[in-house]
């Protein structure tokens, strides 16, 4: 239904990584504009991205207020030259998004190995604690601040001279692993939230190898 010259948005999709959250939809507008509203299950609707010709809307500022809430968005379609116009039922044409719970669903961004340090036959590997856009008391929280011990990292490591990989896990941002003296190793890490049912793992970090800049060696 709706006016003859507007079509309802469709394929509403949440794109979210480390809580940076954008709602995307189709179609590219022809003689129409969109406005987005977002709400929690029990809250009031808040309008964003007024009368836009974009087919995406950044809703990060809204969802970071409480990343454990479940959000619903809707996209309204209006004729480009007459945003007061409504559909046949007396309301603007709109389509609802799927529900979205940031804490449970935001994708984990690709982690970065911050440093590694060898002391004798042990190597300490540190994963960067990436800053998110979630704020408390006017400070931005890190991924660890938000997820606490729900977030673990898996380390994959192997001798530069072979392909056999070993793994280690930590619920902090540091690993301490045993290595063979005189051997160079390569490392990659992955963020994991084991308690999740979807989006449990990040992509693997870039590989870092001993003998390159990030490392430090001490006898």
């Amino acid at each position: 239904s709706g006016t003859t010259n507007t079509v309802a948005a469709y394929n509403l999709t949440w794109k979210s990584t480390n809580f940076k959250t954008i709602l995307e939809w189709e179609p590219k507008p022809v003689n129409q504009v969109y406005t987005v509203q977002i709400s929690t299950k029990s809250g009031d609707w808040k309008s964003k991205c007024f009368y836009t010709t974009d087919t995406e809307c950044d809703l990060t500022d809204e969802i970071v207020k409480d990343v454990k809430q479940t959000y619903l968005a809707r996209v309204f379609s209006y004729p480009a030259g007459n945003v007061e116009s409504t559909g046949s039922a007396g309301e603007p044409l709109y389509e609802n998004s799927p529900e979205f719970t940031p804490y449970l669903e935001t994708n984990l961004g690709q982690p970065t190995i911050q440093s590694f340090e060898q002391v004798g036959t042990k190597v300490n590997v540190t994963v960067e604690d990436e800053r998110t856009l979630v704020r408390r008391n006017n400070t931005f929280l890190s991924l660890r601040d938000v997820f606490g011990k729900d977030l673990i990292y898996t380390l994959y490591y192997w001798k530069s001279s072979s392909s056999g990989k070993k793994t280690a896990k930590t619920n902090t941002n540091e690993f301490l692993i045993d290595v063979d003296k005189g051997e160079n190793y390569c490392f990659s890490v992955q963020a994991v939230i084991p308690s999740r049912t979807v989006n449990r793992k990040s992509t693997d970090s870039p590989v870092e190898c001993m003998g390159q800049e990030k490392g430090e060696f001490r006898e």
């Epitope: 409480d66 454990k68 604690d129 660890r144 997820f147 011990k149 902090t172 540091e174």
Partner: antibody, heavy 117, light 111 residues
Amino acid sequence: VEESEGGLFKPTDTLTLTCTVSGFSLSYYGVSWVRQAPGNGLEWIGTIDSSGRTYYASWANGRFTISNDNAPNTVSLQVNSLAAADTATYFCARDFYGWNSGALDIWGPGTLVTVSS
Amino acid sequence: ELDLTQTASPVSAAVGGTVTINCQASQSVYSNKYLSWYQQKPGQPPKLLIYKASTLASGVPSRFSGSGFGTEFTLTISDVQCDDAATYYCAAAYSDDSDTAFGGGTKVVVE
């Protein structure tokens, strides 16, 4: 954040304290219980995190139960088999991060519980 | 089990001076930095001063600062005021799910 009134209890009694919170959601912040015996330091009892999971000090040995299933915006502490050593001021406090982080940014005034025969 | 040992009480300080209180953990605190500092005055609940080792809590004067990593942490009060007379506690989370602990407290006396 405010604790319910304590009072005088007898050994072996069961104590239930409630912590009522306002202005924030228990789905986003955790709540910890901490006690302080007269003239002594602070002692962490346990925490219920924003996902409803509970964590306890090793000495709490099953006598202490924290829950938030009775009413919205309340967290309860139950202590079974009270002993004189449980005499203390009991505080509830909000965990800033929502998990068991030790960063408690809003505290109740505390309530005195005295255990005596 | 996580054990936090603080500077012995009491610690005396002169108005305008500087006070340093140490907190040593028996093992690394969670992620090496989830340690907090509290101030408590008689008859009052504790007040959060510092969290995550060095982040100043909301409304706390910048005279208070925290530092440290792993097992060794320090609370520094500079330009000490009479109002700073209190007992100070450190508290930390540990990697084991169940463990959070307070230090024994350090009483600061301002002369």
